[in-house]
């Protein structure tokens, strides 16, 4: 569960479970910064607009990121 306040890192938990790209509204990658020393990936779901934090170290999540970027590059002219 991510938190909206910018108090250091954003996420409460990080999941290794990939989400279905079709159920994704938005995928944000927040780079490490002075506020949070680690990369955080926040998936906004189409259903209820809920946000989920994904583990950037997980193989499944890395595959998801590849799939999403591939899909985006197909769509862009």
């Amino acid at each position: 569960v991510p938190l909206s306040r910018t108090v250091r890192c954003t996420c409460i938990s990080i999941s290794n479970q990939p989400v279905n790209p079709r159920s994704l509204e938005k995928l944000e990658i927040i780079p490490a910064s002075q506020f949070c020393p680690r990369v955080e990936i926040i998936a906004t779901m189409k259903k209820k607009g809920e946000k989920r934090c994904l583990n950037p170290e997980s193989k499944a999540i890395k595959n998801l990121l590849k799939a999403v970027s591939k899909e985006r590059s197909k769509r862009s002219p």
Epitope: V1, R5, V7, S13, I14, S15, R38
Partner: antibody
Framework: QVQLVESGGGVAQSGKSLRLSCAAS????????MHWVRQAPGKGLEWLAV????????YYADSVKGRFTISRDNSNNTLNLQMSSLRAEDTALYYC??????????WGKGTLVTVSS | LTQLTQPPSVSLAPGQTATITCGGD??????VHWYQQKPGQAPVLVVY???DRPSGIPERFSGSNSGNTATLTISRVEAGDEADYYC????????????FGGGTKLTVL
């Protein structure tokens, strides 16, 4: 399998302090937020506090804000709850629970805290 | 802060269908989670994200959520289902908190 074992409960005098601990095993502790929830005798569940996976964010229920402090040690897979200025109404069974992105998917068996006046 | 209202008790005979409600303002916009707590035991998650079941939870347990009411349905109720049931949501409106309903005691006659 996931295991959460609370300890540190007991009898404490009103106004005094007590420190609860929760030993976690069977999952990657450092990936998950952790919660404390309590249940007064014969009553319902009351959420108390959560700490994020890396310890950088902590949130509390109004009933314990300023009196209780949640902390964690990821190197030892341990969650703590430091309770101070205890009141009679803090008498309850205290559970630690694992966050699952909204729901709490695993719970310990609880540790009983009795505050005597 | 979100407030969740549950009926204190529900009683029915074995084999019947139990319906336990959880009321809250626009609760349909949030994900609702349900826990079963048997006497002397810790709570167990039985339904999460309105309708999903954790592994090991029988298909007899199902959930729905729309408008101002979320519902936990237990079909073909058994004596072993007798327990307290709690609904819960994550509330991020003012400050982040995890809110429980008051609980419903399910009695199997």
């Amino acid at each position: 399998q996931v295991q959460l074992v609370e300890s540190g409960g007991g009898v404490a005098q009103s106004g005094k302090s007590l420190r609860l601990s929760c030993a976690a095993s069977g999952f990657t502790f450092s990936n998950y937020g952790m919660h404390w929830v309590r249940q007064a005798p014969g009553k319902g569940l009351e959420w108390l506090a959560v700490i994020s996976y890396d310890g950088s964010n902590r949130y509390y229920a109004d009933s314990v804000k300023g009196r209780f402090t949640i902390s964690r040690d990821n190197s030892n897979n341990t969650l703590n709850l430091q309770m101070s200025s205890l009141r009679a109404e803090d008498t309850a069974l205290y559970y630690c629970a694992k966050d699952a992105g909204g729901p709490l998917d695993y719970w310990g068996k609880g540790t009983l805290v009795t505050v005597s006046s | 802060l979100t407030q969740l209202t549950q009926p204190p008790s529900v009683s029915l005979a074995p084999g019947q269908t139990a319906t336990i409600t959880c009321g809250g303002d626009n609760i349909g916009r949030k994900s609702v989670h349900w826990y079963q707590q048997k006497p002397g035991q810790a709570p167990v998650l039985v339904v999460y994200d309105d309708t999903d079941r954790p592994s090991g939870i029988p298909e007899r347990f199902s959930g729905s959520n729309s408008g101002n009411t979320a519902t936990l349905t237990i079909s073909r109720v058994e004596a072993g289902d007798e327990a307290d049931y709690y609904c819960q949501v994550w509330d991020s409106s003012i400050d982040h908190s995890w809110v429980f309903g008051g609980g419903t005691k399910l009695t199997v006659l």
